[in-house]
């Protein structure tokens, strides 16, 4: 077998060895074909190699596994199950590997897996039990503390008939396995709404990134239980206004920093409460950059510079007085 390197340098396996060893149990110092390994760094990199499946002969010492830029397509159940198990694997990056299906139990038998990155994969079919591993109403707790799911929305023509938001949330909530999750990134997924129950069931969250989606309103979302939340990224959405209930919940979180840049704020009479809040709150980061998008006469006005006289609503005429 090809020796793994010492110190920090990486060794590469010769491709022709792959078939010769695939049926054998991996040797302690083995590095899979098309991968680079560093035992000193406990790291294996199989990057941009057009792999179509997860290598079977991963070294038992692996703590950080990069499988980015491949063509994996499907992640089956037990995709990383090995004998002996990959007991040290803590960080797994599968971003940009053309995954369109992640099956139930895909990450089973990884007892130390703390960070998982599935970003930039068109996940048309994410099993509800991808992270929980079983369909029990309460599963064994997942060790995951960081789950990165940025830009996993498939092209519209490849989506199932169900709601994409619903599919993702089902996977996050199944079996309450992710109760220990501290970081969740869901940026760039075209989310139109955030299902109301999702945050209540992720009580350990410290960092939530919902930036670059299409969220129009947070009216039915509750942040009240997220008492550990430190950062909430809502930049680049379609938010028009935040209402009093949301403002009060955010204001009450003891560690929170909120990011609201680049939303199309509607500066009419409904914005008055939010403007009042913004002028006094310290939790919004870069609040001096927030500007109105509508109505046209208010475009580019800075929210912090508005007063109540600026924030009016056109009167709604009774039907008998409306003209066509």
């Amino acid at each position: 077998s090809s020796p793994t390197s010492s110190a920090s340098s990486f060794s590469s396996s010769a491709p022709f060895l792959a078939s010769a060893v695939s049926a054998q149990p991996p040797l302690p110092d083995q590095c899979p074909a098309l991968c680079e390994c560093s035992e000193a760094a406990r790291t294996v990199k199989c990057v941009n190699r057009n792999l179509t499946e997860v290598p079977t002969d991963l070294p038992a010492y692996v703590r950080n596994l990069f499988l980015t830029g491949n063509q994996l397509a499907v992640l089956p159940a037990g995709a990383f199950a090995r004998r002996p198990p990959l007991a040290e694997l803590a960080a797994l990056n599968l971003s940009g590997s053309r995954l369109d299906e992640v099956r139930a139990g895909a990450f089973e038998h990884l007892p130390s897996l703390r960070q998982l990155d599935l970003s930039h994969n068109p996940l048309a079919d994410l099993s509800p039990f991808a992270f929980s591993g079983s369909n029990a109403s309460v599963s064994a707790p997942s060790p995951l503390v960081e789950l990165i799911l940025n830009h996993i929305v498939p092209p519209e023509d490849e989506r199932q008939n169900r709601s994409f938001e619903g599919m993702v949330v089902a996977a996050l909530l199944a079996g309450r396995a992710l109760q220990g999750l501290r970081r969740l990134e869901l940026a760039s997924n075209h989310f139109l709404y955030l299902p109301r129950d999702v945050l209540a069931q992720l009580p350990s969250l410290r960092h939530l990134d919902l930036s670059n989606n299409s969220l129009v309103s947070l009216t039915y979302v509750s942040f009240r239980n997220l008492t550990h939340l430190e950062s909430l990224h809502l930049e680049d959405n379609a938010l028009k206004v935040l209402h009093n209930g949301t403002l009060a919940e955010l204001q009450g979180l003891p560690h929170i920093r909120v990011f609201l840049d680049n939303n199309p704020w509607v500066c009419d009479c409904h914005m008055a409460d939010m403007v009042t809040w913004l002028k006094e709150t310290e939790v919004v980061q870069g609040k001096d950059r927030l500007t109105c998008a509508y109505p046209e006469k208010m475009r580019n006005r800075v929210l912090l510079e508005l007063n109540s006289a600026d924030l009016d609503c056109d009167p709604i005429l009774p039907p008998s007085l409306q003209t066509s």
Partner: antibody, heavy 122, light 111 residues
Framework: EVQLVESGGGLVQPGGSLRLSCAAS????????MSWVRQAPGKGLEWVGF??????????ENSASVKGRFTISRDNSKSSLYLQMNSLKTEDTAVYYC?????????????WGQGTLVTVSS | DIVLTQSPDSLAVSLGERATINCRAS??????????LQWYQQKPGQPPKLLIY???NVESGVPDRFSGSGSGTDFTLTISSLQAEDIAVYFC?????????FGGGTKVEIK
């Protein structure tokens, strides 16, 4: 583990200047508001001012009693907070504490240093 | 500025008994549903230590005999069963408005 260590205190004459430093460790310094609070011998606590975090442009707020004389600044590359004190008066004699605000600064200070004593006397 | 008035100035309580300290603000310290009122404990030669934030939230690591209550302008710190290590000066502080202000302190002693 969050740690705040003040230095730079000492004896200075009225009208003189002094610069206090606070070395921070154990947290992402740029994410947090930082403040100075002082305590005259045998007296209560007095808020001196704070400096905001990166997200809010590192702007400052000072109490009226030190405005125009004291300046709060920070060097994020060194995770350090500073208090430049000019035109010192005898009533500025106090232990000066560096403190970190919570992530939500409305909940005030959760970690404090041990303090450094400034004595203004002729 | 918001003025905080603490009472009493000092308090002598028997070990195991309840100690109650009050703090009154000259105007409401509530903002969008939360009262931004903290309680600190200070022992001689030490910096203040945060006990309670947001009027009633007990800081991590603080014994559960400490509790805070109140809203708007009137607040209370309660030590349900005084221990020897609780002998200290207690300060309330508002962070609703700049400048942040502190109460004058209450010295708790053993009777």
């Amino acid at each position: 583990e969050v740690q705040l260590v003040e230095s730079g205190g000492g004896l200075v004459q009225p009208g003189g200047s002094l610069r206090l430093s606070c070395a921070a460790s154990g947290f992402t310094f740029t994410d947090y508001y930082m403040s100075w609070v002082r305590q005259a011998p045998g007296k209560g606590l007095e808020w001196v001012g704070f400096i905001r975090n990166k997200g809010n442009g590192y702007t400052t707020e000072n109490s009226a009693s030190v405005k125009g004389r004291f300046t709060i600044s920070r060097d994020n590359s060194k995770s350090s907070l500073y208090l430049q004190m000019n035109s010192l008066k005898t009533e500025d004699t106090a232990v000066y504490y560096c403190a970190r605000y919570r992530g939500n600064p409305h909940y005030a200070m959760d970690y404090w240093g041990q303090g450094t004593l400034v004595t203004v006397s002729s | 500025d918001i003025v905080l008035t603490q009472s009493p100035d000092s308090l002598a309580v028997s070990l195991g008994e309840r100690a109650t300290i009050n703090c009154r603000a000259s105007e409401s310290v509530e903002f969008y549903g939360t009262s931004f009122l903290q309680w600190y404990q200070q022992k001689p030669g030490q910096p203040p230590k945060l006990l309670i934030y947001g009027a009633s939230n007990v800081e991590s690591g603080v014994p559960d005999r400490f509790s805070g209550s109140g809203s708007g302008t009137d607040f209370t710190l309660t030590i349900s069963s005084l221990q020897a290590e609780d002998i200290a000066v207690y300060f309330c502080q508002q962070s609703r408005k700049v400048p942040s202000t502190f109460g004058g302190g209450t010295k708790v002693e053993i009777k």
